[in-house]
């Protein structure tokens, strides 16, 4: 056993040691260890084949460390392996495409806070047992195609507290066991109509603190299977463009945030599921005509991104526009500091508690969000609680097979990882 | 700093109700995940319930099921801890606790970061 | 509900020693386990929470390990302030369940 270790075999052949101070993997690691714990020490690199003598391995936590590289064949030969903790190494930035290769029984990947930048191509390839995949709180900017598409059994997906500026067709594609995606705080404007096309048993969907200012419907008909939605905190344009998704939120039968309006004036601070549908008139078009807030691309229905019901019409040219505004006013979605650089609501009117990702209940109180920052092994962000409360419901006994969204979910506990020290 | 304030100690008699509270300061209630539990003199520490956010539910232990109840008053930030039908096995020291769980992150880790410091609640005749 | 069983229920050390309290579920809690260190008439503290990460300000001499069913906490050279109870809580479920304690003595 290494002499900063402990060893012991009952329940299971482990190597542990954390926090001590270890510069390097230690040498004379156990072969038949089937756990070991490196987390908390101050190891940078992780040469190849660092653990081939340990065939039997299947937890190895390398967490809270100060790694900068990680060979490619650093975790060769761990075919058994099954959860991985490479978080809280900021310094990492960038993660070979070939490290995770072979490792066919993971069903659990740290590489939140990390400090990526990307995802390089088939990083995740050959992963078919993987179920959790924390990817939060990086610096991720994009969504490759097909990055996830070896990952039919991933159930979870951790992708807040990114800068990812959008969400591609084939971004998703092969996610058809899904249950949970946290794409909340990052900065994502525009989601393609089919990105979400293989997401049939996806319950849970946060897209709260982005810059979104419209949601084509035809990326919400697949989730079948959606409970939980949360859209707080994007810039939303209230106009005629919207009255599609206000349809949608009419019919679903599940649990949304709100859905605040930014534009029109009129209507800002105002829930777009409580607006009549009469109050979505004509469009927002406050930038002039050529520079509509609407991203998507031009089509036969859109030509210059507009959508069909914001064209000019030779009978109707006033349709265009909010009634009683002129054309050339100033666009409040200017200029919109990304989440992230900003204070929270920063540019989508006043923030009120029930902006937290569990909305709120009609009638609950709404006193401002304070900016104090809780204990300091705590990133700031967004509540876990929101909607407030149903007292005296009976107990439950839910287990959060390994995450359990509550904290964004908690039938009672917490998941994922990251929280360092 | 967030800091969880509770009301001070005491003395009641054998099937009456006490409620006990707690004032968030440097947060909102809206925004927490408040928990509480209880600990007897020379004993261990005993979970009695607590708020789900998933579930948007208060949840309680089986143990006080029916006569423990958790409520909020947003308007103040106080959380309340009220336990009915005393009887002298309840005397106790009472912490109402702040889940870490947070929801950036994505990793809900539930222990209970910051408490309070008690209120002792005497049951005697 | 999960049982959590610890051991020792006791234990005395010297200043500067290594000591280990172990904590037992009575099933699967994967690595949703924390750790408290409570002080006579003062409220618990965390210290550790799923099962390796380390609270904001508590000293590097603590550290937590372990998943499943099995975990411990360790504290390198003791110091005096070290003299408390010791409890582990299972956070997987609702109820939250917690150890019995262990009470460290500083020789």
């Known amino acids: 056993c290494p002499g900063a270790c402990v060893c012991y075999n009952e329940p299971k052949v482990t190597t542990s040691c954390p926090q001590q101070g270890l510069q390097a993997v230690p040498v004379g690691i156990p072969a038949a260890s089937q756990r070991i714990f490196l987390h908390g020490n101050r190891i940078s690199h992780v040469p190849a084949a660092s653990f081939r003598a340990c065939r039997n391995l299947t937890i190895l936590w390398l967490h809270s460390n100060v790694l900068a590289r990680i060979d490619a064949a650093a975790f060769t030969g761990l075919a058994l392996l099954e959860q991985l903790d490479l978080s809280d190494n900021a310094q990492l930035r960038s993660v070979d495409p070939a490290t995770f290769h072979g490792l066919g029984r993971l069903h659990t990947l740290h590489l939140d806070r990390c400090g990526l930048q990307e995802l390089g191509p088939g990083l995740f390839r050959g992963l078919a047992a993987l179920q959790y995949l924390y990817l939060q709180d990086n610096a991720l900017q994009a969504l490759p195609d097909d990055t996830f598409r070896d990952l039919g059994n991933l159930t979870h997906l951790f992708l807040h507290g990114n800068r990812i500026s959008s969400v591609p067709e084939r971004a998703f594609r092969g996610l058809h066991s899904l249950d949970r995606l946290l794409l909340h705080q990052n900065r994502v404007a525009h989601v393609h109509p089919h990105a979400f096309r293989d997401l049939g048993r996806l319950m849970t969907l946060y897209l709260f603190a982005n810059n979104l200012s419209a949601l084509p419907t035809e990326a919400l008909a697949p989730l079948r299977a959606l409970q939980y939605l949360r859209l707080n905190d994007n810039p939303w344009v209230c106009d005629c463009r919207a009255r599609p998704l206000w349809a949608w939120l009419q019919k679903f039968r599940g649990s949304s945030s709100e859905v605040p309006c930014s534009l029109p004036q009129r209507l800002a601070g105002r829930d777009l599921k409580r607006l009549a549908a009469n109050d979505l008139q004509g469009c927002a078009v406050a930038t002039g005509p050529y520079h509509p807030i609407w991203t998507g691309r031009a089509t036969d229905e859109e030509p210059l991104g507009l959508p069909k019901c914001c064209q000019p019409d030779a009978a109707d040219k006033a349709s265009v526009l909010e009634p009683g505004r002129p054309a050339s006013a100033g666009n409040a979605l200017k200029g919109r500091v990304p989440p992230g650089d900003s204070p929270p609501g920063n540019g989508s009117g006043p923030r009120h508690i029930n902006d937290s990702p569990f909305g709120t209940l009609p009638g609950s109180a709404e006193p401002p969000l304070t900016a104090v920052r809780p204990e300091g092994s705590e990133p700031p962000g967004f509540p876990t609680s929101g909607p407030r409360r149903r007292p005296g419901c009976s107990r439950k006994n839910r287990t959060r097979s390994h995450c359990r969204l509550g904290q964004a979910g908690s039938g009672g506990g917490g998941t994922g990882d990251s929280e360092g020290s | 700093q967030m800091q969880l304030v509770q009301s001070g100690a005491e003395v009641k008699k054998p099937g009456a109700s006490v409620k006990v509270s707690c004032k968030v300061s440097g947060y909102t209630l809206s925004e927490l995940s408040i928990h509480w539990v209880r600990q007897a003199p020379g004993k261990g520490l005993e979970w009695m319930g607590g708020f789900d956010p998933e579930d948007d539910e208060t949840v309680y232990a089986q143990k006080f099921q029916g006569r423990v109840t958790l409520t909020d008053d947003t308007s103040t930030d106080t959380a309340y801890m009220e336990l009915s039908s005393l009887r002298s096995e309840d005397t106790a020291v009472y912490y109402c606790?702040?889940?870490?769980?947070?929801?950036?992150?994505?990793?809900?880790?539930?222990?209970?970061?910051?408490w309070g410091r008690g209120t002792m609640i005497t049951v005697s005749s | 509900d999960i049982q959590m069983t610890q051991s020792p229920s006791s234990v005395s050390a010297s200043v500067g020693d290594r000591v280990t309290i172990t904590c037992r579920a009575s099933?699967?809690?994967?690595?949703?386990l924390a750790w408290y260190q409570q002080k006579p008439g003062k409220a618990p503290k965390l210290l550790i929470y799923?099962?390796?990460r380390l609270q904001s300000g508590v000293p590097l001499r603590f550290s937590g390990s372990g998943s499943g069913t099995d975990f411990t906490l360790t504290i390198n050279s003791l110091q005096p302030e070290d003299s408390a109870t010791y409890y582990c809580?299972?956070?997987?479920?609702?109820?939250?369940?917690f150890g019995q304690g262990t009470r460290l003595e500083i020789k």
């Open positions: 799923a099962a390796s």
């Open positions: 809580q299972q956070t997987n479920n609702f109820p939250r369940t």
């Open positions: 099933q699967d809690i994967n690595r949703w």
């Open positions: 606790a702040r889940d870490l769980g947070y929801l950036t992150s994505g990793n809900y880790y539930n222990a209970f970061g910051i």
